[in-house]
Interface confidence: medium
């Protein structure tokens, strides 16, 4: 049997025997195009492809549509993997989405969706989610049914306002909705009463900006 040399996600890498968390090269489905991603091989059995991470405010998340499409930042730190890759990947296979959150008081919580995919760019990378479980709220902080993705230069939200400009960052804004993990990063003691911060309403309420977030995906049949 030939050894697999290209991997479409971190689950394939894990199954190949590479079980150390770190940066790996993934290949777009049905293509030779490559992308670097952080693979979490430790959390909940490993095999997680990290698609977003915030931890210290070192990366500016108020980016353009093109940047969110292609990805930005460093997989070793804060980054966005890229809507196009995630859309193609999740359109091929059933994926789960795990969102890990940390507040400034040392608490951690998570939300797990048992089916996650992004529509294509022609549908503004609209998010589709079902089957919420976890400790970060019984109600989904990503509005259901899912919204289109919006950025500062591509306003696709359901508001007469421009959510991305007001709340900062690209996100699946509703009008403007109960979450934004790509909002402005606020340090400790400056993280409350901030409507444009890193928000997950059904865990921390209105105006609380989180310390760290990670969004990661894995095949449902892993």
């Amino acid at each position: 049997k030939e050894e697999q040399t290209t991997f479409r996600d971190c689950a394939e890498i894990f199954k190949s025997g590479l079980t150390t968390s770190g940066i790996y090269t993934l290949t777009f489905p049905n293509s030779t195009e490559e992308i670097k991603a952080y693979c979490d091989m430790d959390v909940g059995g490993g095999g997680w492809t990290v698609i977003q991470h915030r931890e210290d405010g070192s990366v500016d998340f108020q980016r353009t549509w093109k940047e969110y499409k292609e990805g930005f930042g460093s997989p070793l730190g804060e980054y966005w993997l890229g809507n196009e890759f995630v859309s193609q990947l999740t359109g091929q296979h059933r994926y789960v989405l795990k969102i890990q959150l940390k507040d400034w008081e040392g608490n951690e919580a998570h939300s797990l969706y048992d089916h996650f995919y992004l529509a294509g760019e022609e549908s503004n990378y609209r998010i589709h989610l079902t089957g919420l479980t976890g400790t970060a709220g019984k109600i989904s902080s990503i509005s259901q049914p899912g919204s289109d993705f919006s950025t500062k230069d591509s306003d696709n939200d359901k508001c007469i306002c421009k959510c991305s400009q007001m709340l900062s960052g690209g996100w699946w804004f509703d009008a403007c909705g109960p979450s934004n993990l790509n909002g402005q990063y606020y340090p400790q003691k400056q993280n409350t009463n901030k409507f444009n911060g890193i928000k997950w309403y059904y865990w921390k309420g209105s105006g609380y900006s989180l310390k760290a977030t990670t969004m990661m995906i894995r095949p449902a049949d892993f």
Partner: antibody
């Protein structure tokens, strides 16, 4: 498209109650706050209160506290405003309006308004 | 409660000419997040109010760029660079900083 459709005009006697409905369509009802604003003839707009359509939390203007009750039926995507102990000065057009907010009810604008419901209080 | 005061009460305008409406609040509307919680609405004859400007200076989607909101803290202005016939109606400012949300008394804009 996104719209709010309110119930029809009402004529009530002093001391009675009125319940106005506001049916939302074209968006996820439970993701927003719904506010109620009234306008008496020749008067300025007057905010009455709001409901978080997701969890049902309400907040009322002190002026109407004890007389107004705002509720919602998520299965029907409809918000209701009931005003009791009606008096002649409650004669007004009553509007529902969707709140754009930081989530949690701190609405910083009303982006969609219902067409208004005329309530006349007369003996 | 925060009291909102608008002037003038009535504003006769000539199409193509500029117009300006003032709104004052009894206390600062500048939030700690840097935004002024002041909105402008237009109520055209026989219609519901419609949002023009939110958070002091942000034009709502679909609002022509001839409308501009400015000001900070307690003094705000809505400017129409060139009035058109469709701009007639009553303009209201509203403070959204704290409940009860309160509106100005309105400014009636009419064509001369």
């Amino acid at each position: 498209q996104v719209q709010l459709v309110q119930s029809g005009a009402e004529v009530k006697k002093p001391g009675a109650s009125v319940k106005v409905s506001c049916k939302a369509s074209g968006y996820t009802f439970t993701s927003y706050a719904m506010h109620w604003v009234r306008q008496a003839p020749g008067q300025r707009l007057e905010w009455m209160g709001w409901i978080n359509a997701g969890n049902g939390n309400t907040k009322y203007s002190q002026k109407f506290q004890g007389r107004v009750t705002i509720t919602r039926d998520t299965s029907a995507s409809t918000a209701y405003m009931e005003l009791s102990g009606l008096r002649s000065e409650d004669t007004a057009v009553y509007y529902c309006a969707r709140g754009v907010d930081d989530y949690g009810g701190n609405s910083w604008a009303f982006d969609i308004w219902g067409q208004g419901t005329m309530v006349t209080v007369s003996s | 409660d925060i009291v909102m005061t608008q002037s003038p009460l009535s504003l006769p305008v000539t199409p193509g000419e500029p117009a300006s409406i003032s709104c004052r609040s009894s206390q600062s509307l500048l939030h700690s997040n840097g935004y002024n919680y002041l909105d402008w609405y237009l109520q055209k004859p026989g219609q519901s109010p419609q949002l023009l400007i939110y958070l002091g200076s942000n034009r709502a989607s679909g609002v022509p760029d001839r409308f501009t909101g400015s000001g900070s803290a307690t003094d705000f202005t809505l400017r129409i660079s060139r009035v058109e016939a469709e701009d007639v109606g009553v303009y209201y400012c509203m403070q959204a900083l704290q409940t009860p949300l309160t509106f100005g008394g309105g400014t009636k804009v009419e064509i001369k």
